[in-house]
Interface confidence: medium
Amino acid sequence: TIDTKRNISAEEGGSVILQCHFSSDTAEVTQVDWKQQDQLLAIYSVDLGWHVASVFSDRVVPGPSLGLTFQSLTMNDTGEYFCTYHTYPGGIYKGRIFLKVQESSDDRNGLAQFQTAPLG
């Protein structure tokens, strides 16, 4: 079975961990796909490790475990995310997460954000 948080929220500009937990007494995971709606984000393969779509390669970091860390979130990242676990024996298991990206608290409070960099 797949266990996941059905709905999660994160702030614009921040990051979020997308995680699906697969549990089985007999089946072993051979491959895991992550999709944003119909768009392929990344694949984990037991044989080949992680592959990340070039579309997302600057914002998606594999892990922790078989999850994904999605960085520099924008409002456009709001939507459904799907994990698909390919297992042997046992077949295919799917999980769904709805991510809601919200305006950052600073924006909501009407504050400007300033960043300072150390002098070098």
Partner: antibody, heavy 132, light 107 residues
Framework: QVQLQQWGAGLLKPSETLSLTCAVY????????WTWIRQAPGKGLEWIGE???????DYNPSLKSRVTISVDTSKNQFSLKLRSVTAADTAVYYC??????????????????????????WGQGTTVTVSS | DIQMTQSPSSLSASVGDRVTITCRAS??????LNWYQQKPGKAPKLLIY???SLQSGVPSRFSGSGSGTDFTLTISSLQPEDFATYYC?????????FGQGTRLEIK
């Protein structure tokens, strides 16, 4: 919804240059590999080559001496030119979008070459006949 | 170049049958293997990528397996719209190469 629309001359004489263009409507142009594939009558599929938005191209060695694939990012278009055609180049020519993924190693995704994960959007095909 | 060999080259089956098509690579390609369906006069359609993974919108009766040099495409219960030609494609190295195709016909 991403769509590929292709066009070009359908009837050529031997020694002429085949010229086809494929326009990409919808979706991102920069994040994919843009591919040409052909299929001779009653035969299988043959990969001709591909190009990125930045103009980096890769060709099938069997055709490399005669092929040029170019890109026009201002129009979201890419083109195929095949020189000195013969009857053996008679085929249906398809443009397609190739999704590539980078193999991840620690904090970089550019250590390894990218790998195809399929051509998921195709043009309608253009029948090209070479005959004297 | 990596050679891809499909078997059988043609196959007759009935609606409801379980069908398996095999694809063999001339060298190991790990799981960099894709499957396409093509109907007469139409462009190919991506069914399965990375040996196992079903492309969005493709019915779950299609499944893929294999790694290394030997791969299979299985249709668990043939439907009338499944009669077509199927191609495997390796994406391990360029030039990208396809199998010669398997034509699936109605018995």
């Amino acid at each position: 919804q991403v769509q590929l629309q292709q066009w070009g001359a359908g009837l050529l004489k031997p020694s002429e240059t085949l010229s086809l263009t494929c326009a990409v409507y919808g979706g991102s142009f920069n994040d994919y590999y843009w591919t040409w594939i052909r299929q001779a009558p009653g035969k299988g599929l043959e990969w001709i080559g591909e190009i990125t938005h930045s103009g980096s191209a890769d060709y099938n060695p069997s055709l490399k001496s005669r092929v040029t694939i170019s890109v026009d990012t201002s129009k979201n278009q890419f083109s195929l030119k095949l020189r000195s055609v013969t009857a053996a180049d008679t085929a249906v020519y398809y443009c397609a979008r190739g999704l590539k993924l980078f193999r991840w190693k620690k904090t970089t995704v550019t250590t390894f070459p990218p790998y195809y994960y399929g051509m998921d959007v195709w043009g309608q095909g253009t029948t090209v006949t070479v005959s004297s | 170049d990596i050679q891809m060999t499909q078997s059988p080259s043609s196959l007759s089956a009935s609606v409801g049958d379980r069908v398996t098509i095999t694809c063999r690579a001339s060298q190991s390609i790990s799981s960099y293997l894709n499957w396409y369906q093509q109907k007469p006069g139409k462009a190919p359609k991506l069914l399965i990528y990375s040996a196992y993974s079903l492309q969005s919108g493709v019915p779950s009766r299609f499944s893929g397996s294999g790694s290394g040099t030997d791969f299979t495409l299985t249709i668990s219960s043939l439907q009338p719209e499944d009669f077509a030609t199927y191609y495997c494609q390796q994406s391990y190295s360029t030039p990208i190469t396809f199998g010669q195709g398997t034509r699936l016909e109605i018995k």
